[in-house]
Interface confidence: medium
């Protein structure tokens, strides 16, 4: 379907790109000596960029430094140093810069105070970093500024003495609504959800912390939860790791109503050692990966049903280390139900798998075309490619990005990988697939920084390397072609490449330094590709293109989680701009029922390579840990349940008789009858 | 504690060599350039030469030019100047210094080494 | 290169007046790039402003920093026994590195 990358030549040579470039180039100095650059994007479509320099010299019993803020309204083309709006205040780089939800335009930057100060010191910003207004905190904030999502005025933070500190009036005044508070965080319709210690603290009341829920910015309370030892949200499920009575084990509850009722999740408990993770989720369902017994580095991934109650076995195995908490889990983002991840075999080598269909399947991901099998292969001509992500770079491995997809680049991946048995410690390559993870080739060789503008439009690129750059690469068809541009005569240490969220933007900044004996110069590079992609792509640039599509005789051929979809995509040899306003144009059609589209309730199982669900064997001599909303039910069950998100109409009803399974409630976490209310007076 | 030491100064007759260490404790040696100062008895401060911390990027001053060669060894945390063709008015107090961040000015001075050339 | 000329070369107060000394560049220096060291006979410089502006750690607050361009200034608000040494002026922007002649500050 494609060949094997190209640079320079062979290609489709784009005319008088160099000219074009160099005059879209713009160059900026950052006059200060900081030793370390932080960047953050203000708003959508905005061009406002703030960076944070700061320049640090730690010491035994303080530190020391200054800060310089520097602001772009043009997207990284040229800075203004706006440090005096910051009345040239040391800003804490460990906060960072707290900026507001949407296109608010809120930015707060936390400061350094001296020792004996009675709290903290801010500076917000509404207007998109134009102004900032100092503000002296009643407090001594412990983490980051948290926004409301529903509100940008309303903000949280937690204190080094753990009170929980809510505005309604973005900062300006503070008032403490709750001590003893471990972790806080925001639900939806502006409810703050927290854990407080009854006794001692945090750390020692861990699996005896209190769960509680305010709706109204802390005037009210209702204790939703005992004997926590965590909480989390995930799409519409809110979740909690609860203490078993017995022993010292822990248990996840579901609840979909705020924490008003709570199911018990059909999942194994976890020891003291062990832990839960939540993968991904979304409004339907919830990826769970449950820890295994012992410091073994893997798990077991669960996909829910859209209670978040009834889970299925996904994979064995699931790479997720105890100690760094590294998992190689990725959503791949340009294309619905396709995930990526790591397993570890049985002699501790690492293996990428992949699933189409939300967890329902998972399989190697496919060799490239010509590539050839590396050493750790058996059978050199039978192999895959592993994919590295998280754990890789953890490990200091030479892999400068995890992979990268977004969702108005459709079907686009972009990984470093090998091509084996399993994933290589010798230096990775980059490889693209155009299709969503089903077929691959070699993009670039060896470890690349990459990046994706206007929409899969253009794929820029920077060399990994110990050595000064002065290179960029860039694509306009997907990473076949290659052109290299030399963007700067004097070669700059690289630290990153930096684009606007959302890959929409025709704009990549280049960051790096200049060192020489003397000092370091802090610098960035911003190319605006524009005038590349001269003409707006118009109807003749795009081809229609069935998504999931692997046996295009079948007439099922696309069909995951019940519906297909055709996307209308930029053809490769087209160089158009796709252009800021370009929304993904998507057909679906419904696709009638099977088997596949559902799974097994409770109390029923799949046997291995069959499809359809059987009871379990009366799961005899014990009683079923059960309990859905607090208490004993009767549960009635055809045996299947669709798959969260699923669409299919018609086809195969799996209909049968309806069972009553009587179980007995096990759970004797929060009935009802146990919550109470409190009003903060 | 952040330490400079240098060592390897004494007598020496013009036209001869000498080399100079400087031995750095208490910081990440490798993530600073470093330099040598010199003083004259009596005199001012003038700077000799600097190293970054890769050894990349040299720099020298000009009445030292083409006779000083500087040089480090970061796995041993330590700073070098080798000194050929010494002349009377290369008598001084040398300093070697770290930076206070990867660039600027030098926050920390070792106590100096006496070098006297003299016939 | 970039010459710093200091004035005056001697200054000759007493103890809880204020001190200022000059350092005047040869050509434009960017203010990140300028700092002052104290000397004391027998004994290594220490370092007191960088940034043209900015205090060392634990240089007391009587001694300030300003200016930009050319034209740069230390201030000692009030001089303490202690103050009392040769200051230099240094300019780290381009290479050479290079620092001025030096101020004596000695009791009048």
């Known amino acids: 379907r494609r060949g094997a990358p190209a640079e320079d030549q062979d290609c489709g040579r784009l005319p008088d790109f160099i000219a074009k470039l160099t005059n879209n180039t713009h160059q900026h100095v950052f006059d200060d000596l900081s030793g370390s650059v932080s960047l953050s994007w203000v708003g959508d479509s905005t061009g406002v960029i703030l960076v944070l320099t700061t320049f640090q010299v730690p010491l035994v019993i303080v530190s020391f430094g200054q800060s310089k803020l520097y602001r772009s309204e043009d997207y990284g083309k040229n800075f203004k140093d706006i440090t005096n709006l910051i009345n040239n205040t040391f800003i804490r780089t460990e906060f960072g810069m707290a900026i507001g939800p949407e296109n608010s335009g809120k930015v707060i930057l936390t400061a350094e105070v001296s020792g004996g100060s009675r709290g903290g010191r801010v500076f917000r910003s509404s207007d998109f970093a134009k102004n900032f207004v100092q503000t002296d905190l009643p407090f001594h904030p412990l983490t980051q500024m948290m926004y409301s999502p529903q509100n940008s005025d309303y903000l949280l933070a937690l204190s080094t003495e753990n009170g929980l500190w809510v505005s309604k009036n973005f900062g300006e005044k503070w008032e403490e609504i709750h001590k003893a508070v471990c972790l806080a965080k925001w639900g939806p319709n502006n409810i703050i959800f927290f854990t407080t210690h009854v006794n001692g603290s945090c750390k020692a009341d861990l699996g005896a912390l209190e769960l509680w829920r305010t709706s109204d910015l802390g005037k009210t309370f209702k204790t939703i939860g005992v004997k926590i030892y965590s909480f989390g949200l995930g799409g519409r499920f809110l979740f909690a790791s609860v203490m078993a009575d017995k022993d010292t084990t822990r248990r996840i509850h579901v609840s979909t109503d705020q924490g008003d009722t709570w199911s018990m999740a059909q999942l194994p408990s976890v020891g003291q050692e062990q832990f839960y993770s939540i993968l991904a989720a979304n409004e339907d369902m919830v990826f769970m990966h449950v820890d295994e017994p012992g410091d073994t580095g893997f798990g077991t991934i669960f996909t829910s049903d859209d209670r978040g109650i009834v889970y299925s076995k996904s994979l064995d195995r699931h790479l997720y280390t105890t100690t760094g908490g590294e998992t190689d889990f990725t959503n791949v983002t340009s294309l619905r139900g396709v995930y990526i991840t790591s397993t570890l075999s049985e002699d501790n080598s690492i293996q990428s798998m992949i699933t189409f269909d939300q967890g329902g399947r998972w399989e190697h991901l496919r060799k490239p075309e010509n590539s050839k099998c590396d050493a750790t292969a058996k059978n050199k001509n039978e192999c895959s490619l592993h994919i590295h992500a998280s754990y890789s770079i953890s490990q200091k491995l030479n892999v400068p990005m995890a992979p990268l997809s977004e969702p108005n680049a459709v079907g686009i991946v972009i990984a470093h990988g090998s091509v084996g048995d399993a994933i290589s410690v010798m230096v990775p390559d980059v490889y693209i697939s155009d299709d969503g993870g089903y077929s691959w080739a070699k993009m670039l060789e060896g470890p690349h920084y990459y990046t994706i503008l206007d929409s899969g439009g253009i794929i820029v690129a920077i060399e990994h390397s110990n050595r000064p750059i002065n290179v960029i690469k860039f694509s306009t068809d997907e990473g076949q072609c290659w052109q290299s541009y030399v963007f700067t005569q004097e070669p700059i240490y690289f630290t990153g490449l930096a684009s606007e969220p959302g890959a929409r933007s025709m704009n990549i900044s280049i960051w790096g330094f200049t060192e020489s004996f003397i000092t370091r110069q802090w610098v960035s590079y911003t190319v605006d590709f524009k005038d590349i992609l001269e003409r707006n792509c118009e109807e003749d640039d795009y081809t229609t293109w069935l998504a999931h599509s692997t046996d295009p005789g079948d007439y099922k051929d696309g069909c995951i989680l019940g519906y297909k979809e055709q996307f209308l995509r930029l053809r490769k040899s087209s160089v158009c701009q796709n252009g800021r306003d370009y929304v993904v144009a998507k057909q679906p059609s419904v696709c009638p029922c099977s088997l596949e589209d559902f799974l097994c309730d409770f109390g029923y199982f799949r046997p291995e390579n069959a499809s359809e669900c059987v009871e379990q064997p009366e799961l005899k001599g014990h009683e079923l840990e059960f309990c859905l909303y607090g208490k004993e039910e009767h549960l009635t069950t055809n045996g299947y349940r669709k798959i969260p998100g699923d669409k299919c109409q018609g086809g195969m009803n799996p209909a049968r008789e309806v069972k009553d399974l009587k179980k007995k409630c096990t759970s004797n976490f929060l009935n009802p009858t146990k919550q109470n209310s409190k009003s903060n007076s | 504690e952040v330490q400079l030491v240098e060592s390897g100064g004494g007598l020496v007759q013009p036209g001869r060599s000498l080399r100079l260490s400087c031995a750095a404790s208490?910081?990440?040696?490798?993530?600073?350039?470093m330099h040598w100062v010199r003083q004259a008895p009596g005199k001012g401060l003038e700077w000799v030469s600097g190293i970054s911390w890769n050894s990349g990027s040299i720099g020298y001053a000009d009445s030292v030019k083409g006779r000083f060669t500087i040089s480090r060894d970061n796995a041993k945390n330590s700073l070098y100047l080798q000194m050929n063709s010494l002349r009377a008015e290369d008598t001084a107090l040398y300093y070697c210094a770290k930076p206070l961040y990867r660039g600027g000015p030098f926050d920390i001075w070792g106590q100096g080494t006496m070098v006297t050339v003299s016939s | 290169e970039i010459v710093l000329t200091q004035s005056p070369g001697t200054l000759s107060l007493s103890p809880g007046e204020r001190a200022t000394l000059s350092c005047r560049a040869s050509?434009?220096?960017?203010?990140?790039?300028l700092a002052w060291y104290q000397q004391k006979p027998g004994q290594a410089p220490r370092l007191l402003i960088y940034?043209?502006?900015s205090r060392a750690t634990g240089i007391p607050d009587r001694f300030s920093g300003s200016g930009s361009g050319t034209d740069f200034t230390l201030t000692i608000s009030r001089l303490e026994p202690e103050d009392f040494a040769v200051y230099y002026c240094?300019?780290?922007?381009?290479?050479?590195?290079?620092f001025g002649g030096g101020t004596k500050v000695e009791i009048k």
């Open positions: 050509q434009s220096v960017s203010s990140s790039y």
């Open positions: 240094q300019q780290v922007a381009v290479s050479p590195i290079t």
């Open positions: 208490g910081f990440t040696f490798g993530d600073y350039a």
């Open positions: 940034g043209a502006s």
